[in-house]
């Protein structure tokens, strides 16, 4: 039954739609996370001048943020669905430690930071269902992640602000590339 009995007139259920496909839902999930990143970037850019800073290279040395490269098969030239999907999932798994770092970095957007972290976990689950070659996906080492987190949290205030900015920018770029690639699959 589309609507249970006792439906009141102001509470009419939404009309039946075609069920969401895997590709549609993954697309929506990535856009959900991108909107979350925009909200977090707004707070970061309002709080400090990091978004206009030219000293990014100083902080970037400490970070090994996932990036799409030609060999990953996600670009139009040399596109390879399976290789690309493995890269997207591996990259998202590598971003998780950085998203954990972000959790204590926001005052007024604490809930949004949590939502970005959790929605990324959900995206990984959705993509893993889609992937045929799960063996090729390497999971980051928890011990390495723990020491990286400690190192990042021990940085001075300026570097922490810059790290936050760089994580959000890189994650946004990675997701945008992923979105473009997934739309070709």
């Amino acid at each position: 039954a589309p609507v249970p009995p006792g439906e009141d007139s102001k509470d009419v259920a939404a009309p039946h739609r075609q069920p969401l496909t895997s590709s549609e839902r993954i697309d929506k999930q990535i856009r959900y996370i991108l909107d979350g990143i925009s909200a977090l970037r707004k707070e970061t850019c309002n709080k400090s001048n990091m978004c206009e800073s030219s000293k990014e290279a100083l902080a970037e040395n400490n970070l090994n943020l996932p990036k799409m490269a030609e060999k990953d098969g996600c670009f139009q030239s040399g596109f390879n669905e399976e290789t690309c999907l493995v890269k997207i999932i591996t990259g998202l798994l590598e971003f998780e430690v950085y998203l954990e770092y972000l959790q204590n970095r926001f005052e007024s957007s604490e809930e949004q930071a949590r939502a970005v972290q959790m929605s990324t976990k959900v995206l990984i689950q959705f993509l893993q269902k889609k992937a045929k070659n799960l063996d090729a996906i390497t999971t980051p080492d928890p011990t390495t992640n723990a020491s990286l987190l400690t190192k990042l949290q021990a940085q001075n205030q300026w570097l922490q602000d810059m790290t936050t900015h760089l994580i959000l920018r890189s994650f946004k770029e990675f997701l945008q590339s992923s979105l473009r690639a997934l739309r070709q699959m």
């Epitope: 509470d11 969401l20 839902r25 959900v122």
Partner: nanobody
Framework: QVQLVESGGGLVQPGGSLGLSCAAS????????IGWFRQAPGKEREGVAC????????YYADSVKGRFTISRDNAKDTVYLQMNSLKPEDTAVYYC????????????????????????WGQGTQVTVSS
């Protein structure tokens, strides 16, 4: 055929516990925000709990807060409603529903207990709390 199926209802004594499950056929439950609703005889249907598909956040009506827990297992494509410390006033037919209320970042969580946010409904399972 697209449908939702609830299970786990039954007769339980006041203070007891019961666990409801919601599964889908014809579509992937993991892709939808899920709400549990209930309707007692002669009363309006009310939303009791919901869980997002986007970030797994949850929402509870005041009447069940601290007693009911909603959760989901995306691997099993199932949503659960664990009901503890049940009271006679919890007696009702319990429905699960699936909708897309949670796909926009910054969605209002409390909207998820409004029935118009849902596309698919189950047939319901009876829960009776009585000694």
């Amino acid at each position: 055929q697209v449908q939702l199926v609830e299970s786990g209802g039954g007769l339980v004594q006041p203070g007891g516990s019961l666990g409801l499950s919601c599964a889908a056929s014809g579509f992937t439950l993991a892709y939808y925000g899920i709400g549990w609703f209930r309707q007692a005889p002669g009363k309006e249907r009310e939303g009791v709990a919901c869980i997002s598909s986007s970030d797994l956040s949850t929402y509870y009506a005041d009447s069940v807060k601290g007693r009911f827990t909603i959760s989901r297992d995306n691997a099993k494509d199932t949503v659960y409603l664990q009901m503890n410390s049940l009271k006679p006033e919890d007696t009702a037919v319990y429905y699960c529903a699936a909708g897309t209320w949670d796909l926009k970042f910054g969605y209002s969580r409390s909207n998820c207990v409004r029935s118009y946010e849902y596309d698919y409904w189950g047939q319901g399972t009876q829960v009776t709390v009585s000694s």
